[in-house]
């Protein structure tokens, strides 16, 4: 279990740390003001008590100030994501100060040692902020700390220790090991800034969770459930690098949080929206696509400040690469009767036809089971903007795809050899767009034909009432 009491080992050892030797030139924590998008450009180094670099490097006291905080490192050098983030911030916020917090000497350690250094690094950042606050026109409210992995908790400590309250902290997949279940002051928490937003992309409920599972901000966003990220499977990784390993998969999923944030900066015309939901399963069912009462928000840089009494867990689906935006739809299918369903769940697919484009054939994921004489809700999402929906094709897949289903079908046949054909009756499908919040009802093309069976399809067209809004507000992008 972790060494009690923090950065330099045990609490009681704190007052007896050896002083830095004379030969030690480089401080353990450096503040690099990035004056150019070019990663090769050295920028300027800021240090507490030295005002000259602020003037020499045109530090803008009235502008936004971003502090980018890296995490644990195995290589001891800056990774590519950091340069991309610096560049994206410069592109989006031309006048802003972008400061890279370089704590590589303290992060390039055993993970447990790096964890035990987070408090001291957070304290260094707080001291820098306290010093900057002494300058005219500098406001903590304009400070945005962006921390990746272990860096997210460093940002938490900085926000905790600073005299006053920083404007915003963004946690990009905050580290999990040694922080899961930790005390509120020992990890990133909503108390650390006026607004704390978090992206979770590598959480696992089994095995080691590299990212923290529990919510630690005002809003905690779990793209794709916060675990398996599209484009990060072993196959994808093997295809894109010479020697794909499980390490690359971990890096891909963990780092996805950074790329989602970068995407929100550079593709502000294609914002991704997340929807409040109690858990991933309910979201997968399509239950949570509401924007009422602040239940949806843009993700990343464009997130609207929300300070709920209780933490808000939010979910969304994404594409495998930039731009990550997808279009979410809730599909409510009322099954009013079915015949001879047997043991196995049907496999349904839908194809959506719109004024702009048609979707691919999309599977309807059955999270639990199809309920009879009930409304069954599903989530589907498309990578392209279909425009206004015109019609839907619902297909019941014929032959079983899995050996398990085939076996169940065979067993079902043995017990009821003269089992007549399975059949389901559906009159209408109600669709709600997550992105526009518009609702539409689709009716079967032929009102007399509402049944569907394996290997068959059913077509639905817009019912007469057309699109309607139901006191729902659509998600709006509030550009900072």
């Amino acid at each position: 279990s972790p060494v009690p009491f923090g950065p330099e080992g045990r609490l009681e050892d704190k007052l007896h740390k050896p002083k830095a030797t004379q030969t030690e030139v480089k401080p353990s924590v450096r503040f690099n003001l990035r004056t150019s998008k070019d990663p090769e450009h050295e920028g300027c180094y800021l240090s507490v008590g030295h005002s000259q670099p602020l003037e020499d490097c045109s530090f803008n006291m009235t502008a936004k100030t971003f502090f980018i905080i890296h995490g644990w490192t195995m290589s001891g050098i800056f990774e590519n994501w950091l340069h991309k983030l610096v560049s994206a911030l410069h592109t989006r916020e031309k006048d802003a100060n972008v400061v890279v917090v370089d704590w590589l000497p303290l992060a390039h350690q055993l993970y447990t040692d790096a964890v035990n250094n987070t408090r001291v690094v957070g304290h260094s950042i707080a001291r820098m902020l306290d010093w900057l606050q002494e300058k005219d026109d500098f406001s903590l409210g304009n400070v945005h700390l962006i921390g990746y992995s272990l860096g997210a908790h460093v940002a938490g400590y900085a926000g905790n220790f600073v005299k006053g309250t920083v404007g915003r902290i963004t946690g990009l997949d905050p580290a999990g090991p040694m922080f899961e279940g930790a005390d509120i002051h020992k990890r990133l928490s909503p108390d650390d800034a006026d607004f704390v937003d978090v992206l979770h992309t590598y959480t696992r409920s089994f095995g080691l969770s590299i990212g923290i599972q529990m919510p630690v901000g005002h809003i905690d966003i779990y793209p794709n459930g916060g675990d398996f990220q599209p484009g990060c499977g072993l196959n994808d990784v093997l295809g894109s690098i010479a020697y794909g390993t499980i390490t690359e998969v971990v890096k891909c999923e963990h780092e996805r949080a950074v790329h989602l944030f970068v995407d929100s900066l550079v593709n502000q015309d294609k914002p991704s929206f997340a929807f409040q939901c109690t858990d991933s399963n309910r979201f997968k069912k399509g239950i949570c696509l509401s924007c009422r009462k602040n239940r949806c928000n843009s993700i990343g840089y464009n997130a609207k400040k929300m300070r709920n009494k209780r933490n808000s867990k939010m979910y969304l689906k994404t594409r495998a690469g930039m731009p990550f935006r997808v279009y979410h739809y809730q599909m409510k299918i009322h099954v009013f009767s079915y015949k001879n369903m047997g043991e196995i769940e049907p496999t349904f697919y839908v194809t959506l036809y719109g004024t702009n484009a048609d979707s691919q054939t999309l599977p309807l994921e059955i999270v639990e089971r199809i309920e009879q004489n009930a409304t069954n809700t599903f989530l589907v999402y498309t990578e392209e903007d279909l425009g206004d929906l015109l019609k839907i094709q619902l297909t019941w897949e014929g032959a079983s795809q899995s050996w398990y289903n085939l076996w169940k079908e065979f067993r079902s046949y043995l017990s009821q050899p003269r089992n007549p054909g399975r059949e389901l009756n559906i009159r209408r499908i109600r669709v709600k767009s997550g992105e526009t919040q518009r609702k539409l009802t689709f009716c079967t093309e032929d009102p007399e034909n509402t049944s569907i069976s394996p290997g068959r399809e059913l077509w639905f067209r817009k019912c007469r009432d057309g699109w309607r809004m139901k006191n729902e507000t659509s998600p709006t992008v509030e550009l900072p």
Epitope: P2, P4, F5, G6, L11, E12, K14, L15, R119, H123, A126, N160, F161, V162, K163, G164, E180, G181, A182, D183, I184, H185, K186, S189, P190, D191, Q213, M214, P215, R310
Partner: antibody, heavy 116, light 107 residues
Framework: QVQLVQSGAEVKKPGASVKVSCKAS????????IAWVRQAPGQGLEWMGE????????KYNKKFKGRVTMTRDTSTSTVYMELSSLRSEDTAVYYC?????????WGQGTTVTVSS | DIQMTQSPSSLSASVGDRVTITCKAS??????VAWYQQKPGKSPKLLIY???YRFTGVPSRFSGSGAGTDFTLTISSLQPEDFATYYC?????????FGGGTKVEIK
């Protein structure tokens, strides 16, 4: 080693105020939150609030909001808890505790008796 | 505020017994729960933090488990020095809240 040493017992009249001190040693005083927890006779533990000595940030239990004030003196590594408008139900043992993994280390407690 | 409900409020056990104390949170606190031991006239002592991690110097007979809203403190083989009152506390959010306590007495 880490030590939290509290001031001695107090007897106060209803309506008065009490100020209890907690002197810390053996660790970096400014960077760990110190909480105040009280325990009425025969009762459980009740969190009153906490202070971060470095920045003097405080968090209070709203039950005591307006009656409790937590301060610190970094030169002597001491935190103070003042409770005003005392009533008989404030009779309790008051503990200070330093937080890291949990309330890792506690003071010995200060008995405050409120009686007319 | 998050309420922490402990049960039982008291129990009688013998040396060598396995003792289990439970704590229920009114809302999800994930694994942000600590357990304390308090002997009469003494200050509380931290036993377990983050639901299942033993604090420095705590004997291995003490173990914690649970996540979400349900938590358990187990003493695998009760020793004479373990007769005390035990408290759970959530440290997920402010205000920090304690359970009502469980007094472990000699049978």
């Amino acid at each position: 080693q880490v030590q939290l040493v509290q001031s001695g017992a107090e007897v106060k009249k209803p309506g008065a105020s009490v100020k209890v001190s907690c002197k810390a040693s053996g660790y970096t005083f400014t960077t760990y939150w110190i909480a105040w927890v009280r325990q009425a006779p025969g009762q459980g533990l009740e969190w009153m609030g906490e202070i971060l000595p470095g920045s003097a940030k405080t968090k209070y239990n709203k039950k005591f909001k307006g009656r409790v004030t937590m301060t610190r003196d970094t030169s002597t590594s001491t935190v103070y808890m003042e409770l005003s408008s005392l009533r008989s139900e404030d009779t309790a043992v008051y503990y200070c505790a330093v937080y890291d993994y949990g309330a890792d280390y506690w003071g010995q407690g200060t008995t405050v008796t409120v009686s007319s | 505020d998050i309420q922490m409900t402990q049960s039982p409020s008291s129990l009688s056990a013998s040396v060598g017994d396995r003792v289990t104390i439970t704590c229920k949170a009114s809302q999800d606190v994930y694994t942000a729960v600590a357990w304390y031991q308090q002997k009469p006239g003494k200050s509380p002592k931290l036993l377990i933090y983050s639901a299942s991690y033993r604090f420095t110097g705590v004997p291995s007979r003490f173990s914690g488990s649970g996540a979400g809203t349900d938590f358990t403190l187990t003493i695998s083989s009760l020793q004479p020095e373990d007769f005390a009152t035990y408290y759970c506390q959530q440290h997920y959010s402010i205000p920090r809240t304690f359970g009502g306590g469980t007094k472990v007495e000699i049978k």
